[in-house]
Interface confidence: low
Amino acid sequence: ELVPTSSWNISSELNKDSYLTLDEPMNNITTSLGQTAELHCKVSGNPPPTIRWFKNDAPVVQEPRRLSFRSTIYGSRLRIRNLDTTDTGYFQCVATNGKEVVSSTGVLFVKFGHHHHHH
């Protein structure tokens, strides 16, 4: 069974001017074949954090017109269109401001549904 987790780690050597906060745990999604899913990484920090995406511990690679991630006002958003069952997995975002690191993990489950288009 896939069990979603959220975790965060902060190094002990902090600049008093710097901070990094996981504002909200990542959402979990259960959806159907062919649908679109959005995972949100909600972090804030100073300096502005670098955010990376991983699926099952592997870096996520953007796919033209299907899978993309982009910076948002709240952190980063990962969007996957035309979902396939192979998209099921743990998705983790890792954010760093150069001194601290926070991460959150959510689960995307793509199921065979009654209301989807077969390819």
Epitope: R52, D57, A58, P59, S71, T96, V101
Partner: antibody, heavy 122, light 107 residues
Amino acid sequence: QVQLVQSGAEVKKPGASVKVSCKASGYTFTNYYMHWVRQAPGQGLEWMGIINPSGGSTSYAQKFQGRVTMTRDTSTSTVYMELSSLRSEDTAVYYCARDSSSWYSGWYFDLWGQGTTVTVSS
Amino acid sequence: AIQMTQSPSSLSASVGDRVTITCRASQDVRAHLAWYQQKPGKAPKLLIYAASSLQSGVPSRFSGSGSGTDFTLTISSLQPEDFATYYCQQFNSYPITFGQGTRLEIK
């Protein structure tokens, strides 16, 4: 000292495959992601992909999908990059480059191998 | 893919000069930019990361600035060992991409 040592130069014929090795020393091999970057003669730098030496997971640039395979051997602290179906445009210096950060990735490179020249010629 | 464009492609300067190289991204890369120095027959060397952070061991005459789409690498007083080719690289999104390089030559 901390270093990456790559295998020697290769000459290959079009259609063949090449496997380049990169041996890490002086640091904990499994704590740092490894990238491969290539540079054609007189040209700029081109990122090929990344491997997590701990779990072996990989991500490849779309341009190389289906032709490149990155693997690792933790017992020897070595990563490998194999490129198949070689063509003349693959003639380049191939570098392994360590990711800047341990366990989370910064996607920039603080340690480079010396480079391996691969020549593809009939 | 994000395109990185450096200017100038080459420049000539003298020891002691102040030199600025620019790098422009085709879309916003925030501060996710690095600069490298490469000498002939050698691997690149990291100079600057996160647009303005100096890599450990790199002389303080090197500095970086910028965010979003426009970035600069400045060498405050050129030394003989600084003549090389310089590359910018964005690490905001896949695929990682580099500028075409700026060749710095002795005048």
